[in-house]
């Protein structure tokens, strides 16, 4: 009875726009094969100089690696040749072709539908486990904000297909060991922990084994707890500026804050010849502050138009939130206009700004 419904013609497919570049080709080669990748010019037109890249690093031609503008050959392939290959335009670095190459112990047998994640029988007579993408397993420390999800993966192959188990801090790790449990996907060689908490910190080891051997990988998980702090201002902003009389100037201030920040731009002024009051607080005038329709983006920029000598001086970006305040300052130097500078030079005078 369920047969008819299983074979139902599926409704229209929902198109999900994906990333650039063009679709990645998944290719599987046997150990010892020659890997040949071809990348004809798009639209058949001229291609210009190209570069071949593997896992983000440019390929260096050798006796074994033959590089041409439209073709790449890797002779006598081994596991180490597995990876992501792309052909890029040398000048723009635009990816023209992208290939996912996997080299297995078996003679090549066509496409591999589901990429690196699926468990499979490689067709090798016998074989100890090995990582299918060892270059992806270099990173071992994962720092994650609390309440997010963590996935550890150890994709492997071997014959017979190996089993995978997980340890936490060297001990067997099971779902009942954490609130919220864990999700294991043996087909994807993965362990998932949803909504992590500080007690999830520790070392997680995958153990992949069959009767011919065992391999393991240990990852360290750190769960970050957020402590509220006063706004952080980007170093170097605002920057000191030198401007010509009558020109326009912009000061920038980049504010990072958990709590909603309140941003103000201040100009330091003198009162009765003094820059600070009796209590040591500087005299300032507020140039810009949050209004009904002012966005944070707008507040992060102070624009001065048609500057005069009176605009010279010290400017401060002040950011506060419920925790406290932070401020950075910068100086504006205003120089005379070009013709005044020329006259000054002829007179032998020097302007210090």
């Amino acid at each position: 009875e369920s047969l008819g419904t299983e074979q139902r013609v599926v409704g229209r497919a929902a198109e999900v726009p994906g990333p650039e570049p063009g679709q990645q080709e998944q290719l599987v080669f046997g150990s010892g094969d020659a890997v040949e990748l071809s990348c004809p010019p798009p639209g058949g037109g001229p291609m210009g100089p190209t570069v071949w890249v593997k896992d983000g690093t440019g390929l260096v031609p050798s006796e074994r690696v033959l590089v041409g503008p439209q073709r790449l050959q890797v002779l006598n392939a081994s596991h180490e040749d597995s990876g992501a290959y792309s052909c890029r335009q040398r000048l723009t670095q635009r990816v023209l072709c992208h290939f996912s190459v996997r080299v297995t112990d078996a003679p090549s047998s066509g496409d591999d539908e589901d990429g690196e994640d699926e468990a499979e029988d490689t067709g090798v007579d016998t074989g100890a486990p090995y990582w299918t993408r060892p270059e992806r397993m270099d990173k071992k420390l994962l720092a994650v904000p609390a309440a997010n999800t963590v996935r550890f993966r150890c994709p492997a192959a071997g014959n017979p297909t190996p089993s995978i188990s997980w340890l936490k801090n060297g001990r067997e790790f099971r779902g009942e060991h954490r609130i919220g449990g864990i999700k294991l996907r043996h087909q994807q060689w993965s362990l998932v922990m949803e909504s992590v908490v500080p007690s999830d910190r520790g070392n997680y080891t995958c153990v992949v084994e069959n009767k011919f051997g065992s391999i393991r990988q240990t990852y360290t998980l750190d769960v970050l707890e957020r402590s509220p702090h006063r706004p952080i201002l980007q170093a170097g902003l605002p920057a000191n500026q030198t401007a010509v009389l009558g020109s326009d100037v912009e000061f920038h201030c980049k504010v990072y804050s958990d709590a909603q920040p309140h941003i103000q731009w201040l100009k330091h002024v003198e009162v009765n010849g003094s820059k600070v009051g009796p209590d040591g607080t500087p005299y300032v005038t507020v140039l810009k502050t949050a209004g009904a329709n002012t966005t944070d983006k707008e507040l992060e920029v102070l624009s001065l138009h048609n500057v005069t000598f009176e605009d010279a001086g010290e400017y401060t970006c002040l950011a506060g939130n419920s925790i406290g305040f932070s401020h950075h300052s910068a100086w504006l130097v205003v120089l005379p206009a070009e013709e005044e500078l020329v006259e000054a030079d002829e007179a032998g005078s020097v302007y210090a700004g």
């Epitope: 063009g22 397993m137 904000p145 997010n148 996935r151 993966r153």
Partner: antibody, heavy 127, light 97 residues
Framework: EVQLVESGGGLVQPGGSLRLSCAAS????????ISWVRQAPGKGLEWVGR????????NYADSVKGRFTISADTSKNTAYLQMNSLRAEDTAVYYC????????????????????WGQGTLVTVSS | RSEASGDRVTITCRAS??????VAWYQQKPGKAPKLLIY???FLYSGVPSRFSGSGSGTDFTLTISSLQPEDFATYYC?????????FGQGTKVEIK
């Protein structure tokens, strides 16, 4: 219990501004993100943007870049969507959704998932 | 598309380019907010009935409801989060036959 409540919707003229609020409760606001998603009448879902209050980082859809600004006040557990220069095509129900990351050393991207959604607030841009 | 209670329903989603397994599925009923069903192509979100399952990788993804229940009549959206901005499919409405 995780809850998100949007407010601030209403009728506004083209070129006008509106500020939507998303009050969150029941979870650690600073550890996860807040996304805004809209749905025009009778149409599908369109992602507008998201903020990670942890560091204030924001991303926006091209259709709203430069006009909309997302911010958050962690002391109030509230996210905001400031909408300026509104157009008729911005008419939609606006949803906020808690957004968490799936962190995976094996891949070179972080997958973001929207797991809890508010009830939505209707914004109508019309003269 | 019209379906009957008890049917096995398969909804497909095709990405224009490889999005690995970074695909989520949402269910939306009229006048209500979307609900997360599946993330990372095949992981059932907590509290979602086990009759829902997801599969796929690369460009082709499937949401399966093993035995359609009356409360499952809704619109289903897939969404990729491999790149920013994330994008949704146009939705598939499952109606009562």
């Amino acid at each position: 219990e995780v809850q998100l409540v949007e407010s601030g919707g209403g009728l506004v003229q083209p070129g006008g501004s509106l500020r939507l609020s998303c009050a969150a409760s029941g979870f650690t606001f600073t550890s996860t993100g807040i996304s805004w998603v809209r749905q025009a009448p009778g149409k599908g879902l369109e992602w507008v943007g998201r903020i990670y209050p942890t560091n204030g980082s924001t991303n926006y859809a091209d259709s709203v870049k430069g006009r909309f600004t997302i911010s958050a006040d962690t002391s109030k557990n509230t996210a905001y969507l400031q909408m300026n220069s509104l157009r008729a095509e911005d008419t939609a129900v606006y949803y906020c959704a808690r957004t968490y990351g799936i962190y995976d050393l094996y891949v070179d991207y972080t997958e973001y998932v929207m797991d809890y959604w508010g009830q939505g607030t209707l914004v109508t841009v019309s003269s | 598309r019209s379906e009957a209670s008890g049917d096995r329903v398969t909804i497909t989603c095709r990405a224009s380019q490889d999005v690995s397994t970074a695909v989520a599925w949402y269910q939306q009923k009229p006048g209500k907010a979307p609900k997360l069903l599946i993330y990372s192509a095949s992981f059932l979100y907590s509290g979602v009935p086990s009759r829902f399952s997801g599969s796929g990788s690369g460009t082709d993804f499937t949401l399966t409801i093993s035995s359609l229940q009356p409360e499952d009549f809704a619109t289903y959206y897939c969404q990729q989060s491999y790149t920013t901005p994330p994008t949704f499919g146009q939705g598939t409405k499952v109606e009562i036959k």
